[in-house]
Each structure stands twice: as C-alpha cells, then as structure tokens.
C-alpha cells in the first residue's frame, strides 16, 4: 500500500519530506514566501493530500503561483508609476505614487513607494496599506506676479492665472420679488472651501439681524477672468454658507465667512488655493505690500450721464488688481475717527492704501483676498479680506480701505473646514 514518490511544486515544499509514504500518511503542500498554493483555480495558503488504501494519492500536487497585488488603487489627484518592467504587480514589484504637481503635493513628504507584499497587498513603510494623501498646494500661482502693479481704481487687467485663488461669488435671492442680486469676491483655501467677507453672504434685510443667504442662492466661479465670458470658468454651487457667529452688521467687526462647495474643484493653472497665515494677533506689519484683485468699480469718477448714454456699467468686466501698503493701525484709526459718522477700526481689522489716494478697492471687490508674499515659505498668504471703507469715493485722499485681519481667525477657519491644522502645516506661512 505504498504511494508513489512526491515531487514538491516549483517554489514550494512538502512536509513531512519522507522517502516512502504509506496508507493514511498525510502531506502538507505549502509555497515559498510570495507564492500561493493554486488548486483548481483556487488560491490557498496550504493544501493537504493523503495516501489512500489503494496506493494512490487523494489529489494531484497543486502548483505554486506568485502572489499578485493586482492594479494599485487610484490616488485622487495623483499618478502611479511602475518601477518594475512590464508594469508587473507581482510579489516584490514596486510602484510609486506621486501627486499632480505643481497643484498637489504629498502629505508628510511621503516617498510614495509601495511594494507588493507576500500577503498580496501594496505596502508602504510608513503608511502600511493606506494610500497617501495629495493635498492642494497653496499660494504658488502658475504665473509670477510682475513687480509693477497698478490699481483697481483706474486699473490694470490681471492676466489669467495671476490670482488662481480668486473666486467670484454671485448671490441671487430668487425668493424675493423683485430678485435681489449682488456679488463679491472670495479666496480658494482648498478644493472645497472659499474664504470671503461675511457681509457678502448676509441676507439683505431691513433690520440688523445677521442671517446668511440661502446656500441655493450662491454660485461660485473659479478660474474666471472676464465676467462676460464664464465658459472657461469652473462654477460651483454652495453646500454650506458659514458666517462668523460674532459678525456685527453695524461696524463690520468679525467680517469673515466661508462657503463650502458642493463638489471639490479640480486644481490647475487657473485654480489654486491661497495659503492661510499662522495665528498671530499682530497681523501684517505696517508698510508691508500686499496685492488685492477684484471685479469691482474701477473708475469711480465716471459720471451718471456717461453711464446712461454709453450703456456701460461701473463695475469691471476683467479682473483688476492693485498693490497696497499696510497702514499703521493708529494712523488708520485716527483717519476714521476724524470723520463724521460712527467708524470703528477694531483689532480684527487692518487698513491698507495710500495717504494721497488714487489706489484702492471699491464696491464689488468685497471679500477678496489681500495677499502678502512670504519670503520664507515662498508662498502667497491671505492676510486680509476686503471689508469696508469710506464715506468718500474709493481712492480718495486719506481714505484707507479696511480689511478683515485673517490671522485672528485661523483657528476658526480650520475648525469650520474640519481639518486638523497639522495636516496642512507645511502649507501655512512660516
């Protein structure tokens, strides 16, 4: 009752290994690391056969098949390159995940290298079987901003891609008869969030209550250059509208808000986020130069006669931008206190502009980002949001524009976006 001699499979072994096998002897067939037992197209770790009474084996010896990790999982905003020839996905093969640069970068500077393990899963030394994360790069426009920058008032056109974080926020309240419509700007912070001024998203009511407009009435345009041609822009509806809980309609204190987009927007040369600053109560230093863009009034001196005879509008069709210095807080406070009217420049605001006037933001620019280039991180950081000014015409002498000091609200912004700050630490100002 002796059974025939057994040959172990290629890349496998038989245990116990004996010279002879008799009735009721059992053997266990297993495979080398990185291989699996294959029997009748079924993969298994081991396979047992037995020597039968009639001197035959209960089954044929199975084969050993190399482990296949199969096609690696898709990485959102990422690419996969195969290190092994013929794009092999078998044991010990290597792949490398990378992010769609320059718009995304890998979280925690991960190598992105994954190896096909003996268990048939792609493994990374740090993340294990978890995929890496591609985070949007911030504050790095695809075009570098020129040093000579004119003003929004009497302004200069912004070339497409200069302000890739610039959003046009259109509010159309169709629940009212007649419909109410206005717009402002905002700044893209991530693929799903827009930062803007609260007064842009406050429902226009007779009283001083602060109620956000309905999300259904908000449309956000990104990658937009000319408001007359929205075909090339990405438009998105709002999933959430979040006003700062302490926004004061009387003095515009805490004039900051967020819009969560219905769907994340694809980033590209004309759509990229701006960086958030670090939490710092001082805000931007006096005399630092910042840039602000918008589709607001670019020629405040055009007469009503000209407007009605030419059929033109007072707002800009093409995105305009201006370079403005931060004004010392005391100087700005004094400037507004000397005016008739109840003007209050709080610690949550800063001013920018020129004593002699001529360069300023204006109606329609509200909510736009005042950005400053951070030399250390080599990124553009949103330090302010266009908030208010006046009472004289925009660009008037000694009438500074007032901006929300974003650095006072960094924690609030992260909290609303539901992102731990550590996740995006490399992106913020150093």
């Amino acid at each position: 009752n002796e059974c025939p001699e057994l040959q172990p499979p290629v890349h496998g072994k038989i245990e116990p290994s004996q010279a002879k096998y008799f009735f009721k002897d059992q053997v266990l067939v297993s495979c080398d690391t990185g291989y699996k037992v294959l029997k009748d197209n079924v993969e298994m770790d081991t396979f047992q056969i037995e020597c039968l009474k009639d001197g035959t084996w209960s089954n044929k010896i199975p084969t050993c098949k190399i482990v296949d990790c199969r096609a690696p999982g898709e990485l959102e905003h990422g690419l996969i390159t195969f290190s092994t020839r013929n794009n092999l996905t078998t044991y010990k093969s290597e792949i490398k995940y990378s992010c769609q640069e320059p718009y995304y970068k890998m979280l925690n500077n991960n190598t992105g290298i994954y190896t096909c393990s003996a268990q048939g899963v792609w493994m990374n030394k740090v993340l294990g079987r978890s995929l890496p994360t591609c985070l949007p790069e911030c504050g790095q426009p695809s075009r570098s901003l020129p040093s000579l920058v004119k003003r929004i008032i009497g302004g200069r056109n912004a070339e497409p891609g200069l302000f890739p974080w610039q959003a046009l926020i259109v509010v159309e309240d169709t629940s009212r008869v007649p419909n109410d419509k206005w717009f402002g700007s905002g700044a893209l912070l991530s693929a799903s969030w827009i930062l803007t001024a609260a007064h842009v998203l406050r429902s226009q009511r007779r009283d001083t209550t602060v109620i956000p407009v309905s999300k259904e009435h908000v449309t956000v345009y990104l990658g937009l250059h000319d408001v007359r041609d929205k075909s090339g822009a990405v438009n998105s509806s709002a999933a959430r509208v979040v006003l700062h809980p302490d926004f004061n309609i009387q003095n515009y204190n805490h004039d900051i808000a967020l819009v969560q987009l219905q769907e994340p927007v694809p980033l590209g040369p004309h759509v990229m986020p701006v960086c958030l600053p670090r939490l710092e109560p001082e805000g931007p230093a006096p005399h630092m130069l910042g840039l602000v863009a918008g589709w607001g009034i670019s020629n405040p001196n055009v007469t009503v006669d000209e407007i009605i005879s030419s059929g033109t509008r007072t707002l800009s069709d093409v995105l305009q931008y201006v370079k403005l210095p931060v004004v010392p807080h005391a100087e700005c406070k004094t400037s507004y206190e000397s005016r008739s009217g109840n003007y209050s420049v709080t610690e949550n605001m800063f001013c920018a502009g020129y004593y002699e006037g001529g360069k300023d933001t204006c109606l329609g620019d509200s909510g736009g980002a005042f950005v400053i280039f951070d030399d250390l991180s080599q990124r553009w950081v949103v330090q302010g949001l266009v908030s208010w000014g006046g009472p004289e015409e925009c660009g008037s002498k000694q009438v500074y524009g007032v901006y929300t000091k974003v650095s006072n609200y960094v924690d609030w912004v992260w909290e609303q976006m539901g992102l731990p700050q550590s996740v995006v630490e490399p992106q913020v100002e150093r």
């Epitope: 419509k181 206005w182 226009q204 007779r206 408001v227 405040p300 407007i307 059929g311 509008r313 707002l315």
Partner: antibody
Framework: EVQLQQSGPVLVKPGASGKMSCKAS????????MIWVKQSHGKSLEWIGV????????SYNQKFKGKATLTVDKSSSTAYMELNSLTSEDSAVYYC?????????????????WGTGTTVTVSS | DVLMTQTPLSLPVSLGDQASFSCRSS???????????LHWYLQKPGQSPKLLIY???NRFSGVPDRFSGSGSGTDFTLKISRVEAEDLGVYFC?????????FGGGTKLEIK
C-alpha cells in the same frame, strides 16, 4: 418686501419751492439707482432724472435741469427731489422708482419698483 | 427726443379675449451694445405703475405668463392671451436706449 414710501401731498404757491422724499426699505439702498418720474393729470409719464445712491452722482432730462434737484441721505435710506420756481405746469404726481443695481452686468434702465407717488399742487 | 406712439388710445375687450397693444418709436431702439431697451408698464386705476415686460420680451418676476412682448427696431407689441378683470388699466411702453428716456402716451384697457 422691497418698498418705496413717498411723502404726503405738497401744496405750494407759484414761484415757491417744494421738496418730497422717497424712503426705501427691504433692500440695500446704496447698491441701486433711483429714478424720478412726473405724471401730469391724465397724461403720460416723463423721466426727470436719476441719482446714483452710492455716491450721489446725478443725470437729468434736459427739460428738468434747473427745475429739479435730486439728493440722497444714505443714513436714512431716503432719496429727495426738490422742485423750484413752481408753476401750475408743475402740478402733477411725482414718482420715485428703483433703477438697476450697480452689480448688474447690463444697466438696462427699467424700473422694477415704484413709489406710492407724491401729489404736488401749485395754486395761489 | 425719441417719440413713443401707442395705439389704440383705448382698447375695449371682453374678459377671456386676447388683447394686443402696439408701440412705435420714432427711431430704432437697438442700442450700440446690441440690446433693445423697450419696456412695458401697467398702471391700474389709483395705483403706481408696475413693471410687466423688460427688454422687449422678458416677463418680470411675478407677471403671469399670459403676458408676452415682441418686436424689434421701431415696432413693438404687448399681448395678453386671455384678459382677466385684474388686467384693466393703462399700459405704457417706455424706452431707455436713448437719453432722455421716454414713455408712450398709454393705451387704456377697458371692458366691452
């Protein structure tokens, strides 16, 4: 609800002046233009002028230049029209009406909301 | 000034019938920007005018779809497909293509 509430009737003697008001509510006053229109008894409508609330800029129908003066008080969301050197020809109902928003891409100049009207009677 | 001529002066109709108002301008109302700024207003007895149609054919919010506007250049028409009692009043056409903006003399819609 968007409303324009006009002041009560004005009764003046010939040669005198008369001022009327138009108080706006239910919308952001400074974002819109305000138009003034005259309707003589049983007659059609005549455009007098327009004021840009945002900065007080005005444009007048040549016929009413020197006759009408348009002003605004932003703090009370009120537009005003003063008529001077009144004659019996100026006896009419005067309407304020809301013009386009500064945010409109096409300043179409139709008037979507009209005031209640102020009757001016010039009589000795 | 652009003269706006409305015909007829008075339009007697039966309730449920169609009404048609004509408005003719002394010069073309096509603006250099391509738009035509011709609008229609209704003034009911003892009330202020109300906007019905703007830029030739666009119904203002809240205006029933029985109202429609058409025309181009110098000839324009307002139609009411089925007249209701609440439609009675004076209908004015108005142009804002040329300064000064002008109104037609009005057509009074009356019940037969």
């Amino acid at each position: 609800e968007v409303q324009l509430q006009q002041s009560g009737p004005v009764l003046v003697k010939p040669g005198a002046s008369g001022k009327m008001s138009c108080k706006a509510s239910g919308y952001k006053f400074t974002d819109y233009y305000m138009i003034w229109v005259k309707q003589s008894h049983g007659k059609s409508l005549e455009w007098i002028g327009v004021i840009k609330i945002y900065n007080g800029g005005t444009s007048y129908n040549q016929k009413f230049k020197g006759k009408a003066t348009l002003t605004v008080d932003k703090s009370s969301s009120t537009a005003y029209m003063e008529l001077n050197s009144l004659t019996s020809e100026d006896s009419a109902v005067y309407y304020c009406a809301r013009g386009p928003s500064l945010y409109d891409y096409d300043p179409y100049w139709y008037f979507d909301v009209w005031g209640t009207g102020t009757t001016v009677t010039v009589s000795s | 000034d652009v003269l706006m001529t409305q015909t007829p002066l008075s339009l007697p109709v039966s309730l449920g019938d169609q009404a048609s108002f004509s408005c003719r301008s002394s010069q073309s109302l096509i603006h250099s920007n391509g738009n035509t700024y011709l609008h229609w207003y209704l003034q009911k007895p003892g009330q202020s005018p109300k906007l019905l149609i703007y830029k030739v054919s666009n119904r203002f919010s809240g205006v029933p779809d029985r109202f429609s506007g058409s025309g181009s250049g110098t000839d324009f028409t307002l139609k009411i497909s089925r007249v209701e009692a609440e439609d009675l009043g004076v209908y004015f056409c108005s142009q804002s293509t040329h300064v000064p903006w002008t109104f037609g003399g009005g057509t009074k819609l009356e019940i037969k």
